[in-house]
């Protein structure tokens, strides 16, 4: 008799699913999906919702199963979940699935939008917020200003957007933003279209980033404070095209050291 009395079903919570090195990667990276059960399990299953067959099984008598995706392609992106089961559970009965893990395999992230809150026209003494909005959570956002070589502000955000506050007196100018994965292997977005902040009485306008003269193209993502900034080649994904706003080549950009987020 190998079936002692069981505790209530709440004692069989869903597993946790994570990805290494990240959930957003460029094609060709090796990705490991880790499914961790709250108790030793007998079998783990990794699957994509909507697909009948599980992608992979792992038979391991432990709390952790690893699923290896080698040199991932964009087609391997999508939503993954995992389950676990024990040998004395009913036929076909698995744990509740893990929360979804969305794996994105892409050369570059979609272009963010940049908008001014409450609007692009600033009254005397009024502050303005610039919202850089992408489509992904937990990204690092970078704000640039025309004529300023270094990034103006950085923000890491759990939301798919970040708000940058500009002090009214210094707010007028031309801005753009982009976002990137917070850690290596870095994946960068396209640059937003530029946003012109003007004084009352002047007309604001938006124009494509590629046509805005005199604005520095993004440098690499900042590293953690105290760490050495990554070299350009270490973070720029293969095939990524960022349109520089200065008449210079991308290879001439200087990697910026981690900023202290000085504001403006």
């Amino acid at each position: 008799d190998i079936t002692p009395s069981v505790p209530p079903a709440s004692y069989h919570p869903k597993p946790w699913l994570g990805a290494q090195p990240a959930t957003v990667v460029t094609p060709g990276v090796n990705v490991t999906l880790r499914c961790r059960a709250p108790q030793p399990a007998w079998r783990f299953g990794l699957f994509k919702p909507g697909e009948i067959a599980p992608l992979l099984f792992r038979d391991v008598s432990s709390e952790l199963a690893e699923f290896f995706l080698e040199e991932v392609t964009p087609a391997q992106g999508g939503i993954y979940r995992c389950c676990y089961r024990r040998p004395d559970w009913g036929p076909g009965v698995w744990s509740q699935p893990s929360d979804v893990l969305e794996l994105l395999v892409t050369e570059e992230l979609p272009r963010p939008s940049l908008v001014a809150l409450p609007g692009p026209v600033v009254g005397p003494g009024a502050n303005v917020s610039l919202r850089c909005a992408g489509r992904l959570r937990n990204m690092s956002f970078v704000l640039y200003r025309e004529g300023v070589a270094a990034p103006l502000q950085y923000r890491h955000s759990a939301q798919p957007w970040a708000d940058f506050t500009l002090l009214g007196a210094r707010a007028p100018g031309t801005y753009s933003c982009y976002y990137h994965t917070p850690s290596a292997p870095y994946v960068l977005s396209q640059r937003s279209e530029v946003l012109v902040i003007s004084w009352e009485g002047e007309g604001p306008e938006a124009r494509p980033a590629s046509s805005a003269p005199g604005m520095q193209a993004p440098g690499p993502p900042p590293s953690d404070p105290g760490a050495q900034a990554p070299s350009l080649s270490s973070f720029r994904p293969r095939g990524l095209v960022l349109q520089p706003l200065l008449p210079q080549t991308q290879d001439s950009w200087d990697p910026a050291p981690p900023p202290s987020d000085p504001g403006v």
Epitope: P4, D88, G90, P91, W94, P97
Partner: antibody, heavy 117, light 108 residues
Framework: EVQLLESGGGLVQPGGSLRLSCAAS????????WTWVRQAPGKGLEWVSG???????NYAQNFQGRFTISRDNSKNTLYLQMNSLRAEDTAVYYC???????????WGQGTLVTVSS | QSVLTQPPSASGTPGQRVTISCSGS????????VSWYQQLPGTAPKLLIY???NRPSGVPNRFSGSKSGTSASLAISGLRSEDEADYYC?????????FGGGTKLTVL
Amino acid sequence: EVQLLESGGGLVQPGGSLRLSCAASGFTFSDYYWTWVRQAPGKGLEWVSGSPVFGAANYAQNFQGRFTISRDNSKNTLYLQMNSLRAEDTAVYYCAKAGIPGHFDIWGQGTLVTVSS
Amino acid sequence: QSVLTQPPSASGTPGQRVTISCSGSSSNIGNNYVSWYQQLPGTAPKLLIYGNSNRPSGVPNRFSGSKSGTSASLAISGLRSEDEADYYCQSYDSSSWLFGGGTKLTVL
């Protein structure tokens, strides 16, 4: 409130087909194993088929080939397509949710299928 | 013919303790869990016991389950008239879910 509601039962001639539905509400349908159990008049419970969270459906031997279970997670609905029906398939058909480690913790009220000429 | 064997009937008087047995084999009850269901006339089955001996919330503690080897049993103490119903045991093997043939309990 957790609820299962079966529909699609009725009178059908021998050799005919019927599709039963079970609409679930009150929990995340896609996260669970769902099953059909039937009960002939005056008889006991008989397991028919089950649909896991993922992977192939399983069937009791008597129903393999004639019956097909499916699910639409977007509609929170379980189905049972019954073909080549016989008089002995006359029964109340229940849908039920399976729990861990192996029991049926929530049942619908059942739908009656009568196979007769 | 059910793979799990139950007595077709059982009876008792109010206040009495009644036990219903369920016999299987090593491929089902012997290595897996047992559940019990109550079915009142004209209604759907209701889960009474799962995982050999666990009661879902709302089930009175007059109902208890146990398992030994390839057999299981359901005990009802302090029998009441509303306990008159059909009772089914359930287990499984590697590919199928199994029910006992059912026991009709009469409260005399």
